[in-house]
Interface confidence: medium
């Protein structure tokens, strides 16, 4: 018996549409398929970024597939042909491996490149985006940002730079339709007619940086003779309600302090009818089932009562 | 750890339809392929459809081909079996399955060697 073999895929690479970090490999059948017309072939293609302890793999039909990566690092793919076993009376015969690398040949020394990159995405709304400049630099230097996700027809510079002694130092980024629950990709580069500036790449998803606005219309209720009830209203916005958690600080009599954490937008406290005071604040987070990660918004403001006995009125603010 | 459960099995007259639905959790790739196989009593398994999750890929065993039809709710991470013109020798327990590494559905003669994680199964009787 003649041993089976199958040629690698021909002409694989990994191609740059220029979306910042958002690649496609592809390639062609391998030589020499005329023996396995009957065959419908497979390729297992195994991918990642240099330096990541585990490849990432895939097996598919197709001649292409495409991937975000960190392009700050190089990547490096390795692809072979798969012959399922009704092909060859037997078990599965695997191809040897095409290799091929990418990365984006870097200018300047690590250090230009913008440093505490930090983006918000204030209450659902308002993506903005802060950098420092990179150690060093003199003050000709200018960074630029530029951004893609899925959607976009090609990546879009910013178009209003938050600026400090004439330097770009952030983006308020414009409305973003339907952004959230996908990649989003950041570039920001940099020139200085002295020396070259290393461009920097970052990726995230929106709905894991949101910081809301915080709780509303704090307001008591006295349930029993021992029992108070504290109320507040999700903020103005996008946000639905069963996306938030929430953090009560709670001080009585300037003495106790409790902290809790609540899904919903009461709380019950236990109390002595000899309480004078009582105030309370409330934060707001998205919370696990809208997104992996969220931003604490700021505190409320204090809601308070004091000098009048909570049985008899209920406080609005 | 992927989980897959499935729903919609039942008692069925000939002629008659039903969707089975199967929802996946516990895995983290945007990638994948789901299948739903059968086996009648007495028999083997064998593979009935299977769908991407990304591509407009599907494929079906010759003997539910124009009567059941595969579809996807990616949002939800669920797949349908939609079995209409259904006969007697389509009773069986329907088991729905994943493998999280192909991105294109294989041959349907050789799909039960290529999922790795199963559920646990949901009985369709087609009988008057």
């Known amino acids: 018996d003649t041993e089976i073999k199958v040629n690698p895929p021909q002409d694989f690479e990994i191609v740059d549409p220029g979306y910042l970090g958002y690649l496609y490999l592809q390639w062609q059948p391998p030589l020499s398929l005329d023996h396995f017309k009957e065959c419908t072939v497979e390729y297992e293609l195994k991918y990642r970024n240099i330096g990541s302890e585990t490849w990432k793999t895939i097996i598919t039909k197709n001649l292409h597939y495409k991937d975000g990566f960190d392009l700050n690092k190089g990547i490096e793919a390795k692809i072979h042909t798969l012959l399922p076993w009704q092909c060859t009376n037997g078990s599965e015969v695997q191809s040897s491996w095409a290799e091929t690398t990418y990365w984006i040949s870097p200018q300047g020394i690590p250090e230009t490149k913008v440093q505490d990159m930090d983006c918000v995405y204030y209450n659902w709304q308002y993506l903005l985006c802060s950098w420092k400049p990179g150690i060093g630099v003199l003050l000709d230097t200018n960074y630029n940002l530029f951004y893609w996700y899925e959607g976009l027809d090609h990546a879009l510079q910013c178009v209003d730079y938050i600026k400090a002694d004439g330097q770009n130092i952030g983006c308020r980024f414009p409305y973003l339709e339907a952004s959230d629950y996908k990649d989003f990709y950041i570039c920001v580069n940099g020139s200085s007619e002295n020396k070259p500036i290393r461009s920097s790449y970052f990726t995230f998803q929106l709905q894991n940086i949101v910081k809301p606005l915080p709780p509303v219309y704090l307001t008591f209720t006295r349930e029993s003779s021992c029992e108070i009830k504290l109320k507040w209203s999700i903020p103005l916005g996008p946000i639905p309600a069963r996306c938030f958690d929430y953090e009560i600080e709670i001080r009585e009599d300037d003495t106790t302090l409790v902290t809790a954490t609540v899904e919903n937008e009461t709380y019950t406290l236990k109390t002595t009818n000899e309480t004078r005071q009582l105030c309370f604040v409330v934060r707001s987070k998205v919370n696990i089932y809208c997104s992996d990660d969220g931003i604490w918004s700021e505190w409320s403001d204090k809601q308070c009562w004091e000098g009048e006995d909570l049985s008899k009125k209920t406080l609005l603010r | 750890e992927v989980q897959l459960v499935e729903s919609g099995g039942g008692l069925v007259q000939p002629g008659g339809s039903l969707r089975l639905s199967c929802a996946a959790s516990?895995?983290?790739?945007?990638?994948?392929?789901m299948g739903w196989f059968r086996q009648a009593p007495g028999k083997g398994l064998e593979g009935v459809s299977c769908?991407?999750?990304?591509?407009?890929?599907?494929v079906y065993a010759d003997s539910v081909k124009g009567r059941f039809t595969i579809s996807r709710d990616n949002a939800k991470n669920t797949v349908y079996l939609q079995m209409n013109s259904l006969r007697p020798e389509d009773t069986a327990v329907y088991y729905c399955?994943?493998?999280?590494?192909?991105?294109?559905?294989?041959?349907?003669?050789?799909?039960?060697?290529?999922?790795?994680?199963w559920g646990q199964g949901t009985q369709v009787t087609v009988s008057s």
């Open positions: 516990g895995f983290a790739s945007d990638d994948y392929i």
């Open positions: 769908i991407s999750s990304r591509y407009a890929n599907t």
């Open positions: 399955a994943m493998d999280s590494r192909r991105v294109t559905c294989p041959e349907i003669s050789t799909m039960h060697r290529n999922f790795d994680s």
